[in-house]
């Protein structure tokens, strides 16, 4: 060995300085006999070395590092040896700083593996080994005096956490417990805890469970589940209070909260759900009213809300057929009457007949909002319902009377825009208890069973704004009956339209005599069209060779005219206008020529 | 101090009924749940019955399933047991016991005698 | 439910002596395990709770040890007043069976 490095310490703070010393024994006879010592930090040479022969003959080299800002690094003393460098001595060299004190010191008592874990928050990076200690002692009182030391609790390599077993701890007493923490620039502690184990008993949860139905006990309410829990069996005999979370499966809604609960009820009725909804349900305990921490929150159970009878009014209608009056078509539109009123899984149209106490007669039974049936020879009035898993709605009755009642006046309707259609009406009198307003394609694409229909519950309305299945170019027939107490007013109906269309094209010009200064012409109308409205009138227009134009309007019954006027042996363009309120379309043009006044007339 | 006071022992014929009751005092008698253990002359002890805190858990030994009856006033600070259908190995003496939370007997009445005799 | 077998049922020792009385659980029941002991005409008294946890007064020289099926109720050295009956008793479930006792006799 020709040199050895020695440091005023091998472990500092980071960034302070440090020393070191590199000696050269005189019996390195290979060597120079003045030879130049050099320092290297790492990959990079240091200068600043001060060097002296001793007494000895032994050559010295003093360097000071003014900062040492790596946390770890070897500093080499080396010798020029020909074209390299020859490293005759290295140290490691380490900076850090002393631990900081542990915060968050915190521990739980686990009852199934009968251990007190405690876990810390070492603080920042000290960039050196850096050894945890979980210490503590039993303790009478409130820790101000120590009893016996328990067994130190050293964690694994980079653990931030401890179980201190149950052998050595004391349920119902005190415990002073903290963490050391040591390196080779100091030691810290964290501030002290006291407490008793069992006040830091962290539970595990129940675990949810579906009651199963028994045959004497009422099923759930509608929008209401039934569920039980299973106690964690560790913690039997410690009185906790629960909570309950829930949240529909579908959608973004934030879980609700129900407590607190008893641990021992075992089984809650759960209410206030939405019917027919899938919940998420969890549960979580606390040791209470004595000291502990939540439970995590058990497994989901998945459950699902009974439903609810329908809660709808059913606003009816009826026709009948007219070769068969026997032969009735119901129709019928459920209303909510709250918010939530439950699915229609269907309908029953049923009959009671008289004298048979009990006995219901099913005449359809349908998903439709319609049916048509035989109604028996002695049947005056059936029921309607709505039904689902849950039940049936309140049945409405539904009575066949004569149509007794006077009769509205006045039925007139004008369109509002190309999608719907004012009915107006004078109500008679007395007022009706409503109205019955339907509508559909007229004549010629009439069809009753593709009429829409509502009820007007106001009997003293005078009008109703048709939205529904109303499209433009269409004529529509509207037909309006009053609803009276037991009876029905004679219905009365009307025509319109909620939008016509221009004519499409003009009559076709021909020209049935020609003279010198007149000529005939005929056209064939065009045949109505559905959704058009009709002409109101013709414009004929003709113009000459100078550009002149001159024309003549005819009423919509014209079949022909005849231009007066013309100059002889002149050119003359003609064409037809044909006009309704929707707009106008012209014909095609025709071109002719008077005669000269030499020719004969033309017939 | 803990104190648990048994009373309603005595003699009964077999098919006859008695109410064991124990007065509490010296804790808060309404966090614990409570139980009764019997022991037959010369016999083991045998655990008869606990009630929870509130009243609503009440665990039964398969023999007195169905004949007896655990309660509990916490206005009164005290823990009944009615006794039905008795039977000869039903004589014993039953003790109230305040159980802790992991489930021990802490503390223990002074027991009372109870006799199925004809 | 769950059975407790306790032995022996019965022993004779000195006063001094150690002594060990075992416990054994039909099924395990992690570290639900408590110790009575039990004199003439006098109601029980719990020493150990918990498997190894020594009841308030009770002295140092009973211990316990043990969890999941198998438990041990040990006395270090046996004292004049330690002579009575001592019974197991598992609390891991609501149905809390106690064991069948051992009596421990002076020799």
């Known amino acids: 060995e020709c040199g050895h490095i020695s440091v005023s310490a091998p472990i500092v703070h980071l960034g302070d300085p440090i020393t070191a010393s590199c000696i050269i024994k005189q019996n390195c006879s290979h060597l120079d006999p003045e030879p130049q010592i050099l320092w290297r930090l790492g990959a990079e040479l240091q200068p600043g070395g001060r060097q002296q022969r001793l007494s000895d003959g032994t050559q010295e080299s003093i360097i000071t590092l003014p900062h040492l800002n790596h946390t770890q690094a070897f500093l080499s003393c080396c010798l020029n040896w020909g074209n390299s460098l020859q490293i005759l001595d290295q140290v490691e060299l380490r900076a850090g700083y002393p631990p900081a004190i542990p915060h968050n010191l915190s521990c739980l008592m686990n009852l199934t593996t009968s251990s007190l874990i405690c876990q810390w928050e070492p603080g920042p990076e000290t960039h050196l080994p850096t050894s945890f200690t979980l210490k503590s002692f039993k303790s009478r009182g409130n820790c101000q005096t120590q009893g016996d030391s328990i067994l130190d609790c050293v964690p694994k390599d980079g653990q931030s956490h401890c179980c201190i077993p149950r052998k050595h701890l004391l349920l119902y007493q005190n415990m002073g417990i903290w963490v050391q923490a040591e390196n080779a620039l100091g030691t810290s502690m964290s501030p002290q805890l006291c407490l008793d184990p069992m006040d830091v008993v962290k539970l595990e949860p129940p675990m949810l469970r579906t009651m199963d139905p028994s045959p004497e006990a009422a099923p759930p309410q509608a929008g209401c589940l039934q569920l039980c829990w299973e106690p964690w069996q560790p913690g039997l005999h410690i009185n906790q209070k629960c909570e309950l979370r829930h949240k529909p499966q579908r959608g973004e809604a934030s879980w609700a909260l129900v407590g607190p609960l008893p641990l021992e009820a075992l089984q809650y009725e759960l209410c206030g759900l939405l019917p027919a909804t899938a919940y998420t349900l969890q549960i979580r305990c606390i040791r209470w009213p004595l000291p502990g921490h939540w439970s995590d929150w058990s497994p989901s159970l998945e459950l699902r809300t009974t439903e609810r009878a329908p809660t709808v009014r059913l606003d009816t209608w009826w026709r009948q057929r007219q070769l068969d009056p026997r032969t009735v078509q119901l129709f019928w539109k459920p209303v909510p009457l709250e918010e939530d009123s439950g699915r229609i899984q269907g309908y029953v149209v049923s009959w009671r007949p008289s004298g048979q106490a009990g006995a219901i007669l099913p005449l359809c039974n349908t998903t439709e909002l319609s049916c048509t049936f035989h109604l028996p020879s002695e049947a005056q009035e059936v029921a309607l319902v709505a039904y689902n898993s849950a039940g049936t709605s309140r049945p409405t009755p539904v009575v066949f009377s004569e149509s007794r009642g006077p009769a509205l006046t006045r039925l007139h309707a004008m369109a509002r825009d190309p999608h719907s259609l004012w009915v107006g009406w004078e109500p008679p009198n007395p007022w009706p208890q409503g109205y019955v307003i339907e509508w559909g394609l007229g004549p010629p694409s009439a069809s009753n069973s593709n009429k829409t229909w509502r009820m007007e519950q106001n009997g003293r309305a005078t009008g109703f704004l048709l939205k529904e299945n109303i499209r433009p170019f269409q004529l529509y027939e509207i037909i309006v009956t009053p609803l009276y107490q037991d009876t029905m007013g004679p219905s009365q109906h009307v025509y319109a339209y909620s939008q016509e269309m221009a004519p499409s094209h003009a009559p076709e010009l021909h020209l049935k005599h020609i003279g010198k200064t007149w000529a005939q012409l005929e056209w064939v109308p065009e045949p109505p069209e559905l959704g058009k409205s009709p002409l109101t009138h013709y414009t004929i227009f003709w113009t000459n060779a100078q550009n002149q134009s001159f024309s003549a309007i005819l009423n919509a019954s014209s079949r022909g005219f005849v231009l007066h006027g013309l100059e002889p042996a002149s050119l003359y363009h003609i064409h037809l206008m044909a006009a309704s309120q929707a707009g106008a379309t012209n014909s095609t043009v025709l071109t002719l020529m008077t005669l000269t006044p030499e020719g004969s007339e033309l017939h | 101090e803990v104190q648990l006071l048994e009373s309603g022992g005595g003699l009964v014929q077999p098919g006859g009924s008695l109410r064991l009751s124990c007065a509490a005092s010296?804790?808060?008698?309404?966090?614990?749940?409570m139980g009764w253990v019997r022991q037959a002359p010369g016999k083991g002890l045998e655990w008869v019955s606990s009630i929870s805190s509130s009243g609503g858990v009440t665990p039964y030994a398969d023999s007195v399933k169905g004949r007896f009856t655990i309660s509990r006033d916490n206005s009164k600070n005290t823990l009944y047991l009615q006794m039905n259908s008795l039977r000869a190995e039903d004589t014993a003496v039953y003790y109230c016991a305040k159980l802790g939370e992991l489930g021990m007997f802490h503390k223990w009445g002074q027991g009372t005698l109870v006799t199925v005799s004809s | 439910d769950i059975q407790m077998t306790q032995s022996p049922s019965s022993l004779s020792a000195s006063v001094g002596d150690r002594v060990t009385i075992t416990c054994r659980a039909s099924q395990g029941i992690s570290s639900y395990l408590n110790w009575y002991q039990q004199k003439p005409g006098k109601a029980p008294k719990l020493l150990i709770y918990?498997?190894?946890n020594l009841q308030n007064g009770v002295p140092s020289r009973f211990s316990g040890s043990g969890s999941g099926t198998d438990f041990t109720l040990t006395i270090s050295s046996l004292q004049p007043e330690d002579f009575a009956t001592y019974y197991c008793q598992q609390s891991w479930e609501y149905a809390m069976f106690f064991g069948g006792g051992t009596k421990v006799e002076i020799k």
């Open positions: 918990y498997a190894s």
């Open positions: 010296g804790f808060t008698f309404s966090l614990y749940w």
